[in-house]
């Protein structure tokens, strides 16, 4: 026997008060799949979290961050703040990058520049807190005197993080 | 439902006081990282201080260090923003938010944000 609820398309509920009749879902739910037996509360975008897509009978509504915030999580679940290029985000708020440590977005954590010399390559520019070092050509491909190579910056040590 | 709802707020004079309050409620706050963000008439919203879940670590924003204290208590569910010698520039709408699910080990996000407190610094 086939289910009556079955019947019912997305942007309704099977209404078990009334008989099984396909009720439209109320204000603020919705029911994004047919045969449902209740609809589900739409989403609020409150706070720090702004609406990016209103809800509607059939989907739910879509949340982003106010500026200065990004999105974090499946479906934007929650904002994080935004920091300088140059800096990251602790718990004792947005950081300066340690030496050696560089971050060109505003968001994410700070990397270790670049050991050029891992690849045999010399400094072409040095780092800094927001942009990487640039590696030029290796030593033994440079002119003598043509170049001063810049020793390559040490990785962040443990204990120097910001945190 | 999950709620954080803030008061406390009001018009008082420079050099005055303030505290706010956060009550939450449908989710277990003892687990959260709570934290208090506010946002000046036009500018962006800007972190205040924060707490971890059992009020050991306290983290501020520099221009409020010394003046402002963050507190929560647990067996009420409530947090707390007590302000002292007020400026004006510390006029803005407060707003207490929850640290999401792995706040400070694998982010810093927030999942959970009041309606907000204006609080107004005025003579």
């Known amino acids: 026997l086939q289910d009556p609820c079955s019947n019912c398309p997305a942007g309704t509920f099977c209404d078990n008060n009334r008989n099984q009749i396909c009720s439209p879902c109320p204000p603020n739910s919705f029911s994004s799949a047919g045969g449902q037996r209740t609809c589900d509360i739409c989403r609020q975008c409150k706070g720090v979290f702004r609406t990016r897509k209103e809800c509607s009978s059939t989907s739910n509504a879509e949340c982003d961050c106010t500026p200065g915030f990004h999105c974090l999580g499946a479906g934007c679940s929650m904002c994080e703040q935004d920091c300088k290029q140059g800096q990251e985000l602790t718990k004792k708020g947005c950081k300066d990058c340690c030496f050696g440590t560089f971050n060109d977005q505003k968001r994410g954590i700070c990397r270790p520049w670049t050991n050029c010399s891992l690849d045999g390559k010399s400094v072409l520019v040095n780092g800094t807190k927001e942009r990487d070092v640039v590696c030029g050509p290796s030593p033994a491909d440079l002119s003598p005197g043509a170049s001063s190579v810049t020793p390559p910056a040490p990785a962040r040590e443990p204990g120097h993080s910001p945190q | 439902e999950v709620q954080l709802v803030e008061s406390g707020g009001g018009l008082v004079k420079p050099g005055g006081s303030l505290r706010l309050s956060c009550a939450a409620s449908?989710?277990?706050?003892?687990?959260?990282?709570m934290i208090w963000y506010r946002q000046a008439p036009g500018e962006e919203l800007e972190w205040v201080a924060n707490?971890?879940?059992?009020?050991?670590?306290?983290y501020y924003v520099d221009s409020v260090k010394g003046r402002f204290t963050i507190s929560r208590d647990n067996a009420t569910n409530s947090l707390f923003l007590q302000m002292n010698s007020l400026r004006a520039e510390d006029t803005a709408v407060y707003y207490c938010a929850r640290g999401g699910d792995g706040y400070s080990n694998s982010h810093y996000g927030m999942d959970v944000w009041g309606q907000g407190t204006t609080v107004t610094v005025s003579s």
């Open positions: 449908g989710f277990t706050f003892s687990n959260y990282w």
């Open positions: 707490i971890n879940q059992d009020g050991s670590e306290k």
